[in-house]
Interface confidence: low
Amino acid sequence: IPVIEPSGPELVVKPGETVTLRCVGNGSVEWDGPISPHWTLYSDGPSSVLTTNNATFQNTRTYRCTEPGDPLGGSAAIHLYVKDPARPWNVLAKEVVVFEDQDALLPCLLTDPVLEAGVSLVRLRGRPLLRHTNYSFSPWHGFIIHRAKFIQGQDYQCSALMGGRKVMSISIRLKVQKVIPGPPALTLVPAELVRIRGEAAQIVCSASNIDVDFDVFLQHNTTKLAIPQRSDFHDNRYQKVLTLSLGQVDFQHAGNYSCVASNVQGKHSTSMFFQVVESAYLDLSSEQNLIQEVTVGEGLNLKVMVEAYPGLQGFNWTYLGPFSDHQPEPKLANATTKDTYRHTFTLSLPRLKPSEAGRYSFLARNPGGWRALTFELTLRYPPEVSVIWTSINGSGTLLCAASGYPQPNVTWLQCAGHTDRCDEAQVLQVWVDPHPEVLSQEPFQKVTVQSLLTAETLEHNQTYECRAHNSVGSGSWAFIPISAGARTHPPDEFLFTP
């Protein structure tokens, strides 16, 4: 067993003093642990010497010497106090991590043994400890919180009474980690896998546990696979990783893969599906109808679902006309990935303008080729109405043109008095035109219809109104004759009231 000179077990010195610690053994000896740069270390025959010419409070700690060749593994220790009147504490670690129910050592070392009677442990800023905090103090080691609880994970300070006042150490953060009382934690990557026959694939099953006593295996359908296991320890947990690497996949590799881990507390498993396909695929679909009708000024989101393997090499939204050569703004196109092989692409069309009706196509490309999905967008418009007086085949005729989408229907009203719009109470006659003549009906455009009202004589104290309506709204135009009795009248002899 090695011997330390001076004999100790404790040595008290003042700051600035020279300290020499000599360890002597039968064979070679060495000092344990990292020696701070304040010390000079040298060998003197069978002994090892630690020396400092300027002791500081930071030299306060236990110094241990061992004899590696000693079969009994004996060691000797001396505890050095450097009693600094301004620095009662030497804190060896600012952060301590333990599991619940372990003892937590907060390594604040007292620099002067005389102060031991007046020490206490407090939370940061002098807060008292949480109730039921069971702790003890060792001047050599610091404060020990026994069977630490998760809630005791706090910032602590060591307090010493010096000359009637309490002097605090710098703070020590205690982290108490919860022990997970269950089976090991598992990950199986990827969550889903698709490969073309002949490609390479990799499936990784990993499990972690608080202690090393646990098992993990990877299973294909019902077969347990024999795969070498890689073990590791980090983040205070034991890790076991199984990696299945397939150089060239075939159809027999497809199926369900399960990662299973167990410990004394039970079993945990997670699964994924591996699909092997003959060739690349690219499928486009939409839950929406490909023929869309929206009222002008409103907004629309066009959504396309894409299932593809391998991944997309390109995609875009294109406006195919017929109104202009404008293209959708990229900022209005959004892509979200549901999972590795399924994506959703959305084109937002806010406040639709007349020139934005038409065909919108989503194109996507992967090694399997190009695919497109085209939406037809027709805008709905409320009817716009105009009435003119004209002569057709020598008969005076009111001609009403109504334009909108869907196709408007037309009703004529005759009512008493001069008015902008016929009131129900004033109506004298109503004519419904069951088949107004369609003047124009182009794709993605308004439908224009025309209705004629032949009137031999227009009463001067009456109003003739053409009304048109469709599912979006209605429009009307009131016509008021200026003079009475005329069989035909040129337009300038009449007042037009829109």
């Epitope: 407090v122 002098g126 807060r127 008292p128 307090s159 309490k166």
Partner: antibody
């Protein structure tokens, strides 16, 4: 004798910055363990803690206002300051500063707001 | 945030009576609670800290008790100068939070 007194603009408009000063005597913010906090009380409502500053310049803020609040100190002039940016009418209140003084307790010093200023009324109005 | 629910919001009592005011925390605050008295036009005055410790200079008729989430302030033998609003403050966790206050009137 410990005294604290708040001063501020009285009235200010929405979106302006409120600057408050707490001038104190009878203690020093350089003393180990000492702190100053700010609290406010809208008329007819309860008290709301805003921020603390400690002797070592450690600062704590109410998360509901954190990105609008700044607390600071000038130890040589025995002053603490609070800035509240982009004020709303709902920031109208009486604002108090208070000392967080060391209280002797059998196991350790323990701290609360032990002395308060008289408060300063702040009105935010357009 | 820890919510502090104080009750009652107001109470009326006669000289010489004993009254109790409660503060309920939304989670355990480990005795980190203070009680204050506030009179109109005056600043708050610390009565009790650490749930039950009496601040220097505060009359002994004031006392605090409780643990965990439930705390109370008791005033024995009410005197006319005790008419005020009383409130609690938790500083167990940031943000520090106050109770809503209890207005004590004397009949």
């Amino acid at each position: 004798q410990v005294t604290l007194k708040e001063s501020g603009p009285g009235i200010l408009q929405p979106s302006q910055t409120l600057s408050l000063t707490c001038t104190f005597s009878g203690f020093s913010l350089t003393t180990y363990g000492m702190g100053v906090g700010w609290i406010r009380q809208p008329s007819g409502k309860g008290l709301e803690w805003l921020a603390n500053i400690w002797w070592d310049d450690d600062k704590y803020y109410n998360p509901s206002l954190k990105n609008r609040l700044t607390i600071s100190k000038d130890t040589s002039n025995n002053q603490a300051f609070l800035k509240l940016t982009n004020v709303h009418t709902s920031d109208s209140a009486t604002y108090y500063c208070a000392r967080i003084g060391p209280i002797k307790y059998p196991t350790a010093p323990y701290r609360y707001f032990d002395f308060w200023g008289p408060g300063t009324m702040v009105t935010v109005s357009s | 945030d820890i919510q502090m629910t104080q009750s009652p919001a107001s109470l009326s009592a006669s000289l010489g009576e004993t009254v109790s005011i409660e503060c309920l925390a939304s989670e355990d605050i480990y005795d980190n609670l203070a009680w204050y008295q506030k009179k109109p036009g005056k600043s708050p005055h610390l009565l009790i800290y650490y749930a039950s410790s009496l601040q220097d200079g505060v009359p002994s008729r004031f006392s605090g008790s409780g643990s965990g989430t439930q705390y109370s302030l008791k005033i024995n033998s009410l005197e006319s100068e005790d008419a005020a609003t009383y409130f609690c403050l938790q500083d167990s966790e940031y943000p520090w939070t106050f109770g809503g206050g209890t207005k004590l009137e004397l009949k």
